[in-house]
């Protein structure tokens, strides 16, 4: 009868729907798992970024301090070169005086 | 009749199933979007990590080079100070010799 055909079609449709629901449910579960994993990775990565940024900032600061120290020492070397030259000039003076005396 | 009741129940169950399917489909779409976003963020973050690690390695290497340069310069300053001292002593000695002669 028409009723039983309609009923059969309805049951088939319902079975298909249930099947689709199960598939969707499984897909959703998998996607949620993947999302959780991706978010965990992203969070872990963000923490790594923060740690690396802090380390980099420290190193940049250290490099600047070292650069200033290098400049200071280079200037000190130049100052000592000048002092040595001044002493040589003086030393020559005393040698000249010695020879003349 | 029993048939019409069963049919009505079947239709209700089917409607509920369709409803559940739509809800699951929307939830799945939203979760997939979130997953894509999380993966994009994780990828972007990973690239940032690589860049930061490279920068940090360069800075660590630079700091070591600078430290070596500081050591060299400190040795140079020590050496020049010693030479200055030696020259001063020489000068004083020659002055004493002068006075005595």
């Amino acid at each position: 009868t028409a009723n039983s055909v309609a009923c059969r079609d309805g049951l088939r449709a319902q079975a298909e729907c249930r099947n689709t629901t199960h598939l969707l449910q499984r897909q959703l579960t998998r996607t949620q798992d993947s999302l959780l994993q991706a978010e965990t990775q992203a969070n872990s990565c963000n923490l790594t970024v923060v740690t690396l940024q802090e380390s980099l900032e420290k190193k940049v600061s250290q490099a600047l301090e070292q650069q200033a120290r290098i400049k200071e020492l280079e200037n000190e070397v130049t100052k000592l070169n000048q002092e040595l030259e001044n002493l040589r000039i003086q030393k020559e003076t005393s040698s000249t005086v010695q020879v003349n005396s | 009749t029993a048939n019409s009741v069963a049919c009505r129940d079947g239709l209700r169950a089917q409607a509920e199933c369709r409803n559940t399917t739509h809800l699951l489909q929307r939830q799945l779409t939203r979760t997939q979007d979130s997953l894509l976003q999380a993966e994009t963020q994780a990828n972007s973050c990973n690239l940032t990590v690589v860049t930061l690690q490279e920068s940090l390695e360069k800075k660590v290497s630079q700091a070591l080079e600078q430290q070596a340069r500081i050591k060299e310069l400190e040795n140079e300053v020590t050496k020049l100070n010693q030479e200055l001292e030696n020259l001063r002593i020489q000068k004083e000695t020659s002055s004493t010799v002068q006075v005595n002669s």
Partner: antibody, heavy 114, light 108 residues
């Protein structure tokens, strides 16, 4: 005896890089600064730059990029990157640093002309 | 940028007179100043270092003084052999080093 001597003078065309060499004897560059000074014909003295005993270089503001000073164990070099006619001058090298230069070379004439 | 202003650019004097040459720095150079004498065809010769110290073999008639930005070279009892061009040379804390324009001394 202590001495410094600049390499022979040269005639160069504008834009041709030129390197002058200052050879030292009787003292060590390991404890001495060395400077280059120039004097255009009939003009005053101009300090170009200095290399200290460690090898650090300092340049007059007008000389930055135009000159490069370097050294070996017994020589100090001055490279004129791209000479112009304005660089025609007698170039002196002198031992010392800052304002104190007690030992000078006789100077070498560089002529830049096309 | 350091600038050294030297005055006068030229001066004439008789033997036995006193000559004063001045040098002004555009900023304090903390006595890092020297005076040089140059005769035609010769390299410069240091007379005074660290503003007031007499260099080797330089006669005592040459005297340097000053500090900060103002410096003076005084030649007392000028001799004929003092005819030359005199230059001051200043250097600041970052080793920017500059000569003054020079003073030509003529002996009458």
């Amino acid at each position: 005896a202590q001495s410094v001597k600049e390499s022979e003078g040269r005639l160069v065309t504008p834009g041709t890089p030129l390197t002058l060499t200052c050879t030292v004897s009787g003292f060590s560059l390991s404890n001495s600064g060395m400077s280059w000074v120039r004097q255009a014909p009939g003009k005053g003295l101009e300090w170009i730059g200095l290399i200290n005993s460690y090898g650090t270089t300092y340049y007059a503001s007008w000389a930055k990029g135009r000159f490069t000073i370097s050294k070996t164990s017994t020589t100090v070099e001055l490279k004129i990157t791209s000479p112009t006619t304005e660089d025609t001058a007698t170039y002196f090298c002198a031992r010392g640093a800052g304002s104190s230069y007690g030992l000078w070379g006789q100077g070498t004439l560089v002529t830049v002309s096309s | 940028e350091l600038v050294m202003t030297q005055t006068p650019s030229s001066t004439s004097t008789a033997v036995g007179d006193t000559v004063t040459i001045k040098c002004q720095a555009s900023q304090s150079i903390g006595s890092n100043l020297a005076w040089y004498q140059q005769k035609p065809g010769q390299p410069p010769k240091i007379l005074i270092y660290s503003a007031s110290n007499l260099a080797s073999g330089v006669p005592s008639r040459f005297k340097g003084s000053g500090s900060g930005t103002e410096y003076t070279l005084t030649i007392s009892g000028v001799q004929r052999e003092d005819a030359a061009t005199y230059y001051c040379l200043g250097s600041d804390s970052s080793w920017d080093t500059v000569f003054g324009g020079g003073t030509e001394l003529e002996i009458l």
